[in-house]
Amino acid sequence: ESALITQQDLAPQQRAAPQQKRSSPSEGLCPPGHHISEDGRDCISCKYGQDYSTHWNDLLFCLRCTRCDSGEVELSPCTTTRNTVCQCEEGTFREEDSPEMCRKCRTGCPRGMVKVGDCTPWSDIECVHKESGTKHSGEVPAVEETVTSSPGTPASPCSLSG
């Protein structure tokens, strides 16, 4: 690694930031909207629109603001005490088990089912069977994989010495 020093290399309180206000920690903690200095003596304000902290803390730097992805709309901007709030665009939703991306909502229900719930930013349309009323997740059942064993193990290209 190069020994050249850039602004980024330096600790948060060493970088030029004349606009950042300082105050003293209370019982070793700094209030929301601030982080603590490396020596624990000062509270340094977060930078509006860049970073934030939501609780009393002894973090050495504030938390980076989330940037809304394409396919998301910004409901509220990042402040020094609250992260950005992003929401999936109309017609898309974010599932709990795949929170990293917005997925397109289905346009309709499969045959024999009726729609009982609309597409929202946090859920797909909800379908139930006409007769039974049981929910349908929209997942296509996976085709069972056939596992075939290979005859013998091929020689390893990596020697024992690595």
Epitope: I5, L10, P12, I36, G40, D58
Partner: antibody, heavy 115, light 110 residues
Framework: VEESGGRLVTPGTPLTLTCTVS????????MSWVRQAPGKGLEWIGI?????TTYYASWAKGRFTISKTSTTVDLKVTSPTTEDTATYFC??????????????WGPGTLVTVSS | ALVMTQTPSSVSAAVGGTVTINCQAS??????LAWFQQKPGQPPKLLIY???KLASGVPSRFSGSGSGTEFTLTISDLECDDAATYYC????????????FGGGTEVVVK
């Protein structure tokens, strides 16, 4: 970054290890000490900030003291036991904007504590 | 004290394959996680900082993900040279939190 001072010591004999740096200033970087017992994993001991404030792992408080000059960082093992036998590394902590990380390491110095 | 739990302790895969290593923190460390590679007789080498950012000179076959308490290192297109022990570490981010390491994962390349 280079460590020195590792040797064979008897239990209870204080020992000071030195980390000598060149090409950068200790007034701009925090430095960590990490150790590794033979055949074991890495164990963080503590850190000295760019301003000279020290922080220690919970288990290391009272057992180690970190200090620095303009070009060296010292680790004093106050009262070594056989469990302190390890290779001791010092590492430079680089600030990456929203995270620190130990990006530059010395080769390590071996301390053996035995009676 | 912060505890970092790394799994598995050892994993074996063929050249060209993919290996996934998990790291769990006992408390929220946000994105302050680093991954290191260590070979016998050498100091650790920084691979990834801030959960997913590649250190200088590290090939893009290495990738990191996660946040809060759950983190993952993935090595794809395995090469013989990737045989090493890998460690996660909670990087320095708070004056009261230890910069604890995980127990390590030995990667064997066949």
């Amino acid at each position: 970054v280079e460590e020195s001072g590792g040797r064979l010591v008897t239990p209870g004999t204080p020992l000071t290890l030195t980390c000598t740096v060149s090409g950068f200033s200790l007034s701009n970087y925090a430095m960590s000490w990490v150790r590794q017992a033979p055949g074991k994993g890495l164990e963080w001991i503590g850190i000295i900030s760019s301003s000279g404030t020290t922080y220690y792992a919970s288990w290391a408080k009272g057992r180690f003291t970190i200090s620095k000059t303009s070009t060296t960082v010292d680790l004093k093992v106050t009262s070594p036991t056989t469990e302190d036998t390890a290779t001791y590394f010092c590492a430079r902590e680089t600030y990456y904007g929203y995270s620190y990380a130990a990006g530059l390491w010395g080769p390590g110095t071996l301390v053996t504590v035995s009676s | 004290a912060l505890v970092m739990t790394q799994t598995p302790s050892s994993v074996s895969a063929a050249v060209g394959g993919t290996v996934t290593i998990n790291c769990q923190a006992s408390q929220n460390i946000y994105s302050n996680l680093a991954w290191f590679q260590q070979k016998p007789g050498q100091p650790p080498k920084l691979l990834i900082y801030e959960t997913s950012k590649l250190a200088s000179g590290v090939p893009s076959r290495f990738s990191g993900s996660g946040s809060g308490t759950e983190f993952t290192l993935t090595i794809s297109d395995l090469e013989c040279d990737d045989a090493a022990t890998y460690y996660c570490q909670s990087s320095w981010h708070s004056i009261s939190t230890d910069c604890a390491f995980g127990g390590g994962t030995e990667v064997v390349v066949k």
